[in-house]
């Protein structure tokens, strides 16, 4: 069904995300001891590494169009703080209409 299909898409997206993060770390000179927020896959979308004080914006994943064809592609943000990444704002459920893969509700 569509959920099994979307599972496959998400696994592929996750693998691509990890590659992107590795490349971004190399470009930005990030390592495990660097101040800032490491890139991450949050079970829905990919977040690039960021410096403290930086706000990162991502569009709702293209996959959400499968579930919500009318979606105008909302935007979700996270702040990189000294304590790490903030919660997504708005939450995926409100920005994108779907949070099946969100680990935190």
């Amino acid at each position: 069904g569509s959920m099994a299909h979307s599972d496959g898409i998400f696994k592929k997206e996750q693998a691509m995300c990890l590659e992107k993060i590795q490349r971004a770390n190399e470009l930005m000179g990030f390592n495990d001891s660097s101040p800032g927020c490491p890139g991450m896959w949050d079970n829905i979308t990919c977040w690039k590494p960021a410096h403290v004080g930086e706000m990162v914006l991502v569009s709702c994943p293209e996959l959400f169009r499968i579930f919500n064809p009318d979606q105008d592609m909302g935007v979700v943000s996270r702040n990189c703080t000294e304590d790490g990444w903030s919660e997504p704002f708005p939450h995926y459920f409100d920005a994108c209409g779907f949070d099946e893969y969100e680990s935190e509700t």
């Epitope: 919500n68 009318d70 979606q71 909302g74 708005p90 409100d94 209409g97 949070d99 099946e100 509700t105």
Partner: antibody, heavy 123, light 107 residues
């Protein structure tokens, strides 16, 4: 045609619990595409969203901070209805209470509402 | 919480008039804005969603526009059944706050 039918007492004593039920016809409380909301309206506070419940492989609830410590919204799948419980009420909780269905199309909106129940908190 | 304000709080108009109601959010909400109409003793009724999309069954004399923090609801050629109170509501992030309302009455 989706219809929401509210029931519950119109008078509650201070410090007691306000309990209302919203019966759903034409849809299911377990729908994978809807949210089920409670809103209230009073002259002093206007329209105030209180919270919602929804099912997406598991049940989730979100509540307004203003009532978070006192509110519970529970789905009842056997009767396809959902309920509102508001504990430790005061006269400031006097309002018309509405249940409403949330639907997604680019954003969440409230497209079907119950008829409203005037709840007075008084001894 | 995101605060919503509306202006004017009330207005008097005649049948056939074109009226505009303004809604402002305390922070950017993109286009996550809805408009509702309420008549005395009744529940609110959805008119416009996503700032400018007309809900099914709503007459085309109603239209919405705006993005970010500033939004407008326009009623072209006001009809007798349009005399009511109008509310905006943000659904960008819970709690989903409403504006205080604009009452439209007969001049």
């Amino acid at each position: 045609q989706v219809q929401l039918q509210q029931s519950g007492p119109g008078l509650v004593k201070p410090s007691q619990t306000l309990s209302l039920t919203c019966a759903i016809s034409g849809d299911s409380v377990s729908s994978n595409s809807a949210t089920w909301n409670w809103i209230r309206q009073s002259p002093s506070r206007g329209l105030e969203w209180l919270g919602r419940t929804y099912y997406r492989s598991k049940w989730s609830n979100h509540y307004a901070v203003s009532v978070k410590s006192r509110i519970t919204i529970n789905p009842d799948t056997s009767k396809s209805q959902f309920s509102l419980q508001l504990n430790s009420v005061t006269p400031e909780d006097t309002a018309v209470y509405y249940c409403a269905r949330g639907t997604w199309k680019q954003l969440w909106f409230l497209d079907h509402w119950g008829q409203g129940t005037l709840v007075t908190v008084s001894s | 919480d995101i605060q919503m304000t509306q202006s004017p709080s009330s207005l008097s108009a005649s049948v056939g008039d074109r009226i505009t109601i303004t809604c402002r959010a305390s922070q950017s909400i993109s286009r996550y804005l809805n408009w509702y109409q309420q008549k005395p003793g009744k529940a609110p009724k959805l008119l416009i969603y996503a700032a400018s999309s007309l809900q099914s069954g709503i007459p085309s004399r109603f239209s919405g526009s705006g993005s970010g923090t500033d939004f407008t609801l326009t009623i072209n050629s006001l009809q007798p059944e349009d005399f009511a109170t109008y509310f905006c509501q943000q659904s960008y992030s819970p709690p989903f706050t409403f504006g205080p309302g604009t009452k439209v009455d007969i001049k």
